[in-house]
Interface confidence: medium
């Protein structure tokens, strides 16, 4: 886990304390009263203590060379970009209509959601995107997927099986050019069958954070750099999906 | 450069269809959604809906959903809308425009007029 | 679908600073809304100003600013020049469609 402030995340944002987001990013600094990791609700939550998580790897050990968001992305005009390599049919979903007002402040239409579910995301990623998934695991899951397109790559692919080999793991990898780059494997696994879950992803300028029922999960470096073009996010896999929406912070 | 060029003004008959392009040049094609936009004389703007050239998965202006049918052809990086059982209703400025979290580039609008 | 409202036309003079608002009608515009500003000048010519509520496009001139006001988005135009009187259309995202403003026509006299 990383000790970013708030200050470091949001550095140059002109906003050090932006709505929905703890005092602090991951642990409080000293002097904050010892409450570490402070998380407010639908805020992306404090990261752990180091070695909070078991089987972690340590900082530094994930390949995928982290990368600043370009400064100025490529022209454009409307929200909406694209998407992915077509896995994620957009027929018979809701979204697919346009008739659907969002929710709240943004997301997916109200109601259970088709699986596999495409949200569009306006105008690609961006540093301080939060993207939230509710939703409950089905009973003797096997696989859940989320894939944050760009094209026909997969900038990331996180991949929580639940029997792979008799144990429970967590992939992230990225794939380019029709081809899978290396692993990055967690061992830490909090999702359960039959289970609700909540799957925060925050985008900072050199990676995704992840955090699963309000607990930091795992960061994953951008290997795509071109975020702005990151325009989808597929989400497939043994659920029932409740909502699917995105915020700034 | 970005470029967006669109094909020329159209004359057609009511009931009749017409098919419009838009050619994109100077970005990644299948990097961004495609919108089609529509103006009538003196009236502001309708999205029609949005098209994602990657894999052509396209999301509709409800309103539009039985008239325009989006398609793209990556080969040639262009997107074309083609508009069915016209009426003067459908006489407009129809305008393409990428996306992206910065805003920036639309086409120079192509005229369509219907009448008998 | 939601409804987009913005003023309908603004007079301003060179040098002087104004600013158009843009409202929907499903309650406070937020950065999920992604809310674009866009210019219209005569012959169809459009250029895309603002993105992402606060983002210039590259080429945009610095006078130019997106930012959230109250429960509405805003575009600001600091210094305004003669150049700038055009017709400005907002545009916010509605979780998969996009509903335009009905424009504000700026006069600078």
């Known amino acids: 886990a990383d000790n970013f402030s708030l200050h470091d995340a949001l550095s140059g944002s002109g906003n050090p304390n932006p709505q929905g987001w703890p005092g602090a990013w991951g642990n409080q600094p000293a002097g904050a009263g010892g409450y570490p990791g402070a998380s407010y609700p639908g805020a992306y939550p404090g990261q752990a203590p180091p070695g909070a998580y078991p089987g972690q790897a340590p900082p530094g050990a994930y390949p995928g060379a982290p990368g600043a968001y370009p400064g100025a992305p490529a022209p454009g005009v409307y929200p909406g970009p694209p998407s992915g390599p077509g896995a994620y049919p957009s027929s018979g979903q809701p979204s697919a209509t346009g008739a659907y007002p969002a929710t709240g402040p943004y997301g997916a239409p109200a109601g259970p959601l088709i699986v596999p579910y495409n949200l569009p995301l306006p105008g690609g990623v961006v540093p301080r995107m939060l993207i939230t998934i509710l939703g409950t695991v089905k009973p003797n899951a096997n696989r859940i997927a989320l894939d944050f397109q760009r094209g026909n790559d997969v900038a990331f692919h996180f991949n929580p099986r639940f029997n792979e080999n008799n144990r429970r793991v967590i992939v992230c990898n990225t794939k380019l050019d029709n081809n899978w780059g290396r692993e990055e494997r967690q061992s830490v696994f909090p999702f359960e069958s039959g289970k609700p879950f909540k799957i925060q992803v925050l985008v900072e300028p050199d990676h995704f954070k992840v955090a699963v029922n309000d607990a930091h999960l795992l960061q994953y470096n951008h290997r795509v750099k071109k975020l702005n073009e990151i325009s989808k996010l597929g989400i497939s896999g043994d659920i029932d999906l409740t909502s699917a929406s995105y915020t700034m912070i | 450069q970005v470029q967006l060029q669109q094909s020329g003004a159209e004359l057609v008959r009511p009931g009749a269809s017409v098919k419009l392009s838009c050619k994109a040049s100077g970005y990644t094609f299948t990097g961004y959604w495609l919108n089609w936009v529509k103006q009538r004389p003196g009236q502001g703007l309708e999205w029609i809906g949005m098209i994602d050239p990657s894999d052509s998965e396209t999301h509709y202006n409800q309103v539009f959903k039985d008239k325009a049918t989006m398609t793209v052809d990556r080969s040639s990086s262009t997107a074309y809308m083609q508009l069915s059982g016209l009426t003067s209703e459908d006489s407009a400025v129809y305008y393409c425009?990428?996306?992206?979290?910065?805003?920036?580039?639309w086409g120079q609008g192509t005229t369509l007029t219907v009448s008998s | 679908q939601a409804v987009v409202t913005q003023e309908s036309a603004l007079t301003t003079s060179p040098g002087e600073t104004v600013t158009l608002t843009c409202r929907s009608s499903?309650?406070?515009?937020?950065?999920?809304?992604?809310a674009n500003w866009d210019q219209e000048k005569p012959d169809h010519l459009f250029t895309g100003l603002i993105g992402g509520t606060n983002n210039r496009a590259p080429g945009v001139p610095a006078r130019f600013s997106g930012s959230l006001i109250g429960d509405k988005a805003a575009l600001t135009i600091t210094g305004a020049q003669t150049e700038d009187e055009a017709i400005y259309f907002c545009?916010?995202?509605?979780?998969?469609?996009?509903?335009f403003g009905g424009g504000t026509k700026v006069t600078v006299l």
């Open positions: 425009a990428n996306s992206n979290y910065a805003s920036g580039s």
């Open positions: 499903t309650g406070a515009v937020t950065t999920s809304n992604y």
């Open positions: 545009a916010l995202w509605y979780s998969n469609h996009l509903v």
